[in-house]
C-alpha cells in the first residue's frame, strides 16, 4: 500500500492504490548536495548522475572505518525520496549529486559554497530547464552561505533546505535562515512535529512549511534493492524538493516567489499541534504541511499572499523590526505584534526602492515584531498614503484617493508611549470602506494599489466582551491582504494574518475589565483579482 508520507502529500483526487500523480517532474533537474550516493540502486537507477564534485572534510577519529554503504546512506535515501520509482515524490525527476558531506555526515561551509558555485557555473555553461537545489544539511548561522544561496536564487534556481534537527529556532542555522531558500521542518504521520531523541525539528519564522519527516521509507545503500526508514528535516526537505519538481514540470515558468506562494497555498493548514513548540515560537511558526496541488494547472487566477514575520526588535526603547517581501512580491499591508502590548505601531516605508514593514517598540516594551503581508500581484502599482496625527476628536483618517486604487492594508504608528489608554475607541464611519482610521495622536498609513481587475472589501468582527483573540476570515475566492485592529482598544497586543484569517490578540482577559475598553474589533481587508481569473480562463 502507499506509504503514509506519499499519501499525506497527495490530494484526494490523486489517491488510488498507489501514488501516481500526473507528470513526475520530468522537465526538472534536482541537484542534491549531500553524502556520496549509490546511484545504481534499483529505486533510482538511471535517475541520478553523480557529478565529479567532491569537497568534504576528513572523518573524525583514528578508528573510523569507511564502510561504503554507511557513507552512501543519507544521500541514497534522499535521492530515493525525491525521485525513487517506488517511494519517490517526483518519479520522473532527474537528479545530479554533489558530495559535500563525508561518511559521518559532516561538511564545511566552504565545501557547500564551492558546491553552489559549481551548480551556478554548470547552469551558465549548459542551461537546462527549471533547477531545484536540495540542501539537506544545517550548520550554524553563516552570512556568507546565506549570501551564496541568495545569489543562486536570484539567478532563478529554487533552493530547498532542511530546517535542522536541533529543536531550536531555524533562524540560528544556515542555510535555513536564508530568506530566499525554502526552509522545511519535519512532521510525523500524526501531523505532529518530529522528535528525534532529545531533539527534533527546528521551528520559527525562518521555516516556510513542514513536510513528512519521520519513518520515511526510501532506498537503502545496504544493498541494491534494499529499503530503509529514516527520519529528519532532510527527509522533509526532500519531499518539498519533489513537490517543487512536480509543480515546475507542470508550470516551468514559475518564479521562486510564485512557487513558494503555491507551496504555502496548497499546504494542509492548522493540523500541527503547536503545543510542541516553545510558547514564544508558536505564533511565528507556520502551521502548514506541504502537499501537491490538487491540479497542476489553473492556479494562476488566485491572488496568493503569505505572512512574513520579522526578527524580534529587541527591548530597547527605540528598537524597530523590519519585515520584507521577496523581490517579486508586493507588500500589501503591514502590522505589528508585541507580547507585552507595549509598541508604537508600524508603518510601511520605502527602502532601496521597495516597501518594507517597520514596527516600533515602546518604552518599557520587551520588543516587537513587524508582520508583512506579501502578495503576488502582477502589474501592480502600489503606494502608501499617510495622514499625520489629526488632533481632531474624530481621529485620523486616510483613504485611497487616486482613481482605480483600492485599499489593501492599514497601519498606524504613534510617538506617544501610552496611546489609547483611557480613551474611547474611535469607530470607522460606516459606508466608507476605502479608508483607514486611527487615533488622533497616530499617523495612519493606507496601502493603496492599482492592478488590473483588483477589487477589495473590508470585513470586521467585533466582540464587546474582552477576549484574548478575535478573528475574522475572508470567504472562499477572496484573499486576506490586510489585518488590523480597530483603534481604541489599549490592550491589543497586535494583529497578524494566519493564512486567510486576520487575528487580533489582546492581553490576558483576566487583567482587563469588561468595559468598552474590552471591546476588540478585528478588521480584515479581503481582495481578489478578476483579471487573473479571466486570464486563466482564456489559457485553459
Amino acid at each position: 500500500s502507499i506509504p503514509w508520507n506519499l499519501e499525506r502529500i497527495t490530494p484526494p483526487r490523486y489517491r488510488a492504490d498507489e501514488y501516481q500523480p500526473p507528470d513526475g517532474g520530468s522537465l526538472v533537474e534536482v541537484y542534491l548536495l549531500d553524502t556520496s550516493i549509490q546511484s545504481d540502486h534499483r529505486e533510482i537507477e538511471g535517475r541520478v548522475m553523480v557529478t565529479d564534485f567532491e569537497n568534504v572534510p576528513e572523518e573524525d577519529g583514528t578508528r573510523f572505518h569507511r564502510q561504503a554503504s554507511k557513507c552512501d546512506s543519507h544521500g541514497t535515501h534522499l535521492a530515493g525520496v525525491v525521485s525513487g520509482r517506488d517511494a519517490g515524490v517526483a518519479k520522473g525527476a532527474s537528479m545530479r549529486s554533489l558530495r559535500v558531506l563525508n561518511c559521518q555526515g559532516k561538511g564545511t561551509v566552504s565545501g557547500t559554497l564551492i558546491g553552489l558555485e559549481f551548480i551556478r557555473k554548470s547552469q551558465l555553461v549548459q542551461p537546462v530547464g527549471p533547477l531545484v537545489v536540495l540542501l539537506p544539511l544545517a550548520g550554524g548561522y553563516s552570512r556568507v552561505l546565506n549570501a551564496a544561496c541568495q545569489r543562486l536564487a536570484r539567478a532563478g534556481v529554487v533552493l530547498v533546505t532542511a530546517a535542522g534537527n536541533f529543536r531550536d529556532d531555524a533562524c540560528l542555522y544556515s542555510p535555513a535562515s536564508a530568506p530566499e531558500v525554502i526552509t522545511v521542518g519535519a512532521t510525523n504521520a500524526q501531523d505532529q512535529p518530529v522528535t528525534l531523541g532529545t531533539l527534533g525539528t527546528n521551528f520559527g519564522r525562518c521555516v516556510d512549511l513542514f513536510a513528512p519527516g519521520e519513518d520515511i521509507i526510501g532506498a537503502s545503500s545496504d544493498c541494491s534493492t534494499c529499503f530503509v526508514s529514516q527520519s529528519g528535516t532532510s527527509q522533509a526537505a526532500a519531499h518539498v524538493a519533489g513537490i517543487a519538481a512536480m509543480m515546475l514540470s507542470a508550470e516551468p515558468e514559475l518564479t521562486l516567489a510564485e512557487l513558494r506562494q503555491r507551496l504555502i497555498h496548497f499546504s494542509a493548514k492548522d493540523v500541527i499541534n503547536e503545543a510542541w513548540f516553545p510558547e514564544d515560537q508558536r505564533v511565528l511558526t507556520p502551521n502548514l504541511v506541504a502537499a501537491l496541488p490538487p491540479s497542476t494547472h489553473g492556479a494562476g487566477w488566485q491572488l496568493f499572499c503569505r505572512t512574513v514575520w520579522s526578527a524580534h526588535s529587541g527591548p530597547t526603547r527605540m528598537a524597530t523590526a523590519v519585515a520584507r517581501c521577496a523581490p517579486d512580491e508586493e507588500l500589501l499591508s503591514c502590522s505589528s505584534f508585541s507580547r507585552s502590548g507595549k509598541r508604537r505601531g508600524e508603518r510601511m516605508e520605502a527602502q532601496g526602492g521597495k516597501l518594507v514593514c517597520r514596527a516600533h517598540n515602546a518604552f518599557g516594551g520587551e520588543g516587537v515584531y513587524a508582520i508583512a503581508r506579501c502578495c503576488l500581484l502582477p502589474q501592480a502599482n502600489c503606494s502608501v498614503h499617510t495622514a499625520p496625527p489629526a488632533e481632531a476628536s474624530m481621529g485620523t483618517r486616510v483613504h485611497c484617493h487616486q482613481q482605480g486604487h483600492v485599499l489593501t492594508g492599514c497601519s498606524s504608528h504613534w510617538e506617544v508611549e501610552d496611546l489609547g489608554t483611557h480613551k474611547p475607541p474611535v469607530l470607522r464611519p460606516r459606508g466608507q470602506p476605502n479608508q483607514c482610521v486611527g487615533h488622533r495622536e497616530a499617523s495612519i498609513h493606507a496601502s493603496c494599489c492599482h492592478a488590473p481587475g483588483l477589487e477589495c472589501k473590508v470585513k470586521e468582527h467585533g466582540i464587546p466582551a474582552p477576549q484574548e483573540q478575535v478573528t475574522v476570515a475572508c470567504e472562499e475566492g477572496w484573499t486576506l491582504t490586510g489585518c488590523s485592529a480597530l483603534p481604541g482598544t489599549s490592550h491589543v497586543l497586535g494583529a497578524y494574518a494566519v493564512d486567510n484569517t486576520c487575528v487580533v490578540r489582546s492581553r490576558d482577559v483576566s487583567t482587563t475589565g469588561s468595559t468598552s475598553e474590552g471591546a476588540v474589533t478585528a478588521v480584515a481587508i479581503c481582495c481578489r483579482s478578476r483579471h487573473l481569473a479571466q486570464a486563466s480562463q482564456e489559457l485553459q
Epitope: 545504481d40 537507477e45 548522475m49
Partner: antibody, heavy 115, light 107 residues
Framework: QVQLVQSGAEVKKPGASVKVSCKAS????????ISWVRQAPGQGLEWMGW????????NYAQKLQGRGTMTTDPSTSTAYMELRSLRSDDTAVYYC????????WGQGTTVTVSS | DIQMTQSPSSLSASVGDRVTITCRAS??????LNWYQQKPGKAPKLLIY???TRPTGVPSRFSGSGSGTDFTLTISSLQPEDFATYYC?????????FGQGTKVEIK
C-alpha cells in the same frame, strides 16, 4: 550513444569455466549496474544476476548455486560474468543489459558446452 | 520468486490487425514491468517500461497498460516488422523474472 559490446563466442568442455566480458560506453557508468541474462536454444530468457559498477555489489539468482561470479572493472568500463563447472545445459546465448530495468542490451555471446 | 504468466504463447495475425498480449504476475508488482521484442538471432529490444511508458524511438502503435498483477501489451495495427517474440519482465523483486514469451506469426 549507449553501447554494450560483448566478447566473442566460446566453446568449452564440461567442467571448465568461461568468462564473458561486456564493455559499456555512452552513459554515466555509476548510474546503472549490469544485469546478465541467458537464453538457451529455443527457450525463453533467464535472469542470472546484477553487478554494480559503483561498488561491485552483486545480486545473484539462486539457480547459479555459487557457480557464477559477476565483477566490474570501472577503469576499463567493463563488466564480467564468470561461470564455473560448466554443464551441457549451460549452452546458451549470454547477454549483458544495462541496470535492473535492462533498457539496453549487448549483442550476446554464444557459449557452447560440449565434450 | 514472482511468476510471470504470458498469454497466448503464440498467435497468428495479419498486417493491420490489432494484437493484444497479456501478462499476469503471481503477486503485486506495482508498475515495475517491461515489455521486450526479440527477433531470431538478435538481442531483446525494450518496447515498454514502467508498464506503460514508451522509450524514444519505439513506434506509437505499441502501448502498454495495467498495474498490480495484470498487464497488457497492445499493437494497434500490426506491421510486417512486428512479427517476433514478445516477453514481459518484472523487476519489482529479485530475481527479475520473464514471461515465457508470445510468438506473433503471420497468418
Amino acid at each position: 550513444q549507449v553501447q554494450l559490446v560483448q566478447s566473442g563466442a566460446e566453446v568449452k568442455k564440461p567442467g571448465a569455466s568461461v568468462k564473458v566480458s561486456c564493455k559499456a560506453s555512452g552513459y554515466s557508468l555509476t548510474s546503472y549496474g549490469i544485469s546478465w541474462v541467458r537464453q538457451a536454444p529455443g527457450q525463453g530468457l533467464e535472469w542470472m544476476g546484477w553487478v554494480s559498477f559503483y561498488n561491485g555489489q552483486t545480486n545473484y539468482a539462486q539457480k547459479l548455486q555459487g557457480r557464477g561470479t559477476m565483477t566490474t572493472d570501472p577503469s576499463t568500463s567493463t563488466a564480467y560474468m564468470e561461470l564455473r563447472s560448466l554443464r551441457s545445459d549451460d549452452t546458451a546465448v549470454y547477454y549483458c543489459a544495462r541496470g535492473f530495468g535492462m533498457d539496453r542490451w549487448g549483442q550476446g555471446t554464444t557459449v557452447t558446452v560440449s565434450s | 520468486d514472482i511468476q510471470m504468466t504470458q498469454s497466448p504463447s503464440s498467435l497468428s495475425a495479419s498486417v493491420g490487425d490489432r494484437v493484444t498480449i497479456t501478462c499476469r504476475a503471481s503477486q503485486n508488482i506495482n508498475n515495475w514491468l517491461n515489455w521486450y521484442q526479440q527477433k531470431p538471432g538478435k538481442a531483446p529490444k525494450l518496447l515498454i517500461y514502467g508498464a506503460s511508458t514508451r522509450p524514444t524511438g519505439v513506434p506509437s502503435r505499441f502501448s502498454g497498460s495495467g498495474s498490480g498483477t495484470d498487464f497488457t501489451l497492445t499493437i494497434s495495427s500490426l506491421q510486417p516488422e512486428d512479427f517476433a517474440t514478445y516477453y514481459c519482465q518484472q523487476w519489482d523483486d529479485t530475481p527479475n523474472t520473464f514471461g515465457q514469451g508470445t510468438k506473433v506469426e503471420i497468418k
